[in-house]
Interface confidence: low
Amino acid sequence: EAEEDGDLQCLCVKTTSQVRPRHITSLEVIKAGPHCPTAQLIATLKNGRKICLDLQAPLYKKIIKKLLES
Amino acid sequence: EAEEDGDLQCLCVKTTSQVRPRHITSLEVIKAGPHCPTAQLIATLKNGRKICLDLQAPLYKKIIKKLLES
Amino acid sequence: EAEEDGDLQCLCVKTTSQVRPRHITSLEVIKAGPHCPTAQLIATLKNGRKICLDLQAPLYKKIIKKLLES
Amino acid sequence: EAEEDGDLQCLCVKTTSQVRPRHITSLEVIKAGPHCPTAQLIATLKNGRKICLDLQAPLYKKIIKKLLES
């Protein structure tokens, strides 16, 4: 199906590890699959912007911890 | 302001801790905020269903670990 | 701030217009801004996957219409 | 199955049609489903707040149009 085509691949082509955890309101972890060979971490910032986080940087653990602290 | 009318609430009414990590394709961590006093963990299953996970550790850590393993 | 750096730019580098509206559960429209010169349309599929839609294709209007029909 | 416990509900309790399009940075259209009988329109404002928009008001079309204008 066309949804599976090479066009779709990964949503995250560029990633960053430069983000302040307190600016993040939610984080989505998307499993690797036929559409994308690597897992993806997409953060939503307070202003509604979305960014992809670097999986190699240990930052995401800190972010998840911070998000879960109520 | 009238914008105040458009209130959100928690998405998660009930939570479960019995979910098989391998059934999950993505996981969203939503920070607590004015709309909801507790952080929320929403998993999307392979069949497209969304469920709320119990924040009690460490199941979600296991799930995140599994999702990130490519 | 580093979050504003060129690395972040647009989340959607690749887009598709080949997607079945019925496979989509939600659609996010992100306004253009300093981080990204064009608006972005991100669709979430039933299986939790996310894809970027082509803004030039009139398909997204059909998708929005379909999503709003309850 | 115990997974059934993790129910979601509608995010939007109240909606508003009183919102200035220029205050909105992103808009999410969520399809109705088992978790919620009606489609939902959630706007993220510049200040990071999220509000639910009234689906009956034609305003959202104007907002989407404005968001997509780069």
Partner: antibody
Framework: SLEESGGRLVTPGGPLTLTCTVS????????VSWVRQAPGEGLEWIGT?????NTYYASWAKGRFTISKTSTTVDLRITSPTTEDTATYFC?????????????WGPGTLVTVSS | QVLTQTPSSVSAAVGGTVTINCQAS????????LAWYQQKPGQPPKLLIY???DLASGVPSRFKGSGSGTQFILTISGVQCDDAASYYC?????????????FGGGTEVVVE
């Protein structure tokens, strides 16, 4: 910590409620289970109440026991005690979100059912 | 769902090794959701191992858990007098097909 109370000598048939009082953690973050141990016997899982008040019971315990909670206590109601319900009753907190691996236990409270 | 523990009783010399088996009648939830406890007379149980092989906080490394699916083992090496107690395995099963949680029948360890 956890502490059970309410254990006593009862006659068969009269309902009995045991209370588990928690301190040092929140019931909005952890589930609590009830486990019992008859004299000289092994451990038996009775049931669990989760963060979101979902309850799960052992098949043998359904209808015989009811678990409920407030913000700081978890109650176990024995609907109609029989002599087989004579045991020490423990409440326990899960290490995680599972229905097993209980890392914090109360000291137990003894229930004796006798006519 | 049943967890069968063997043997029901075992004797060991100080410094020796004890092996306790726990067999599940069907595969555990997520394959490894099994815990081991130690219980001494008049006391509540103490968690030793969870997730089949993870050591609980403060538990000496001479306690070792292994196994997956339906077969699990608790090994106590370099047995000490303080290890004399009853040991129980506890498994988590799929709640939708019966009991969420089940304990094994127990194994009494006597240290000579």
């Amino acid at each position: 910590s956890l502490e059970e109370s309410g254990g006593r000598l009862v006659t068969p048939g009269g309902p009995l409620t045991l209370t588990c009082t928690v301190s040092g953690f929140s019931l909005s973050s952890y589930g609590v289970s009830w486990v019992r141990q008859a004299p000289g016997e092994g451990l038996e899982w009775i049931g669990t109440i989760t963060v979101s008040r979902n309850t799960y019971y052992a098949s043998w315990a359904k209808g015989r026991f009811t678990i409920s909670k407030t913000s700081t206590t978890v109650d176990l109601r024995i609907t109609s005690p029989t002599t087989e319900d004579t045991a020490t009753y423990f409440c326990a907190r899960s290490l995680s979100s599972y229905y097993y691996a209980f890392n914090i236990w109360g000291p137990g409270t003894l229930v004796t059912v006798s006519s | 769902q049943v967890l069968t523990q063997t043997p029901s009783s075992v004797s060991a010399a100080v410094g020796g090794t004890v092996t306790i088996n726990c067999q599940a009648s069907q595969s555990l939830y997520d394959e490894k959701n099994l815990a081991w406890y130690q219980q001494k007379p008049g006391q509540p149980p103490k968690l030793l191992i969870y997730d089949a092989s993870d050591l609980a906080s403060g538990v000496p490394s001479r306690f070792k858990g292994s196994g997956s699916g339906t077969q699990f083992i608790l090994t106590i090496s370099g047995v000490q007098c303080d290890d004399a107690a009853s040991y129980y395995c506890q498994g988590e099963f799929d709640c939708s097909s019966g009991d969420c949680s089940v304990f094994g029948g127990g194994t009494e360890v006597v240290v000579e």
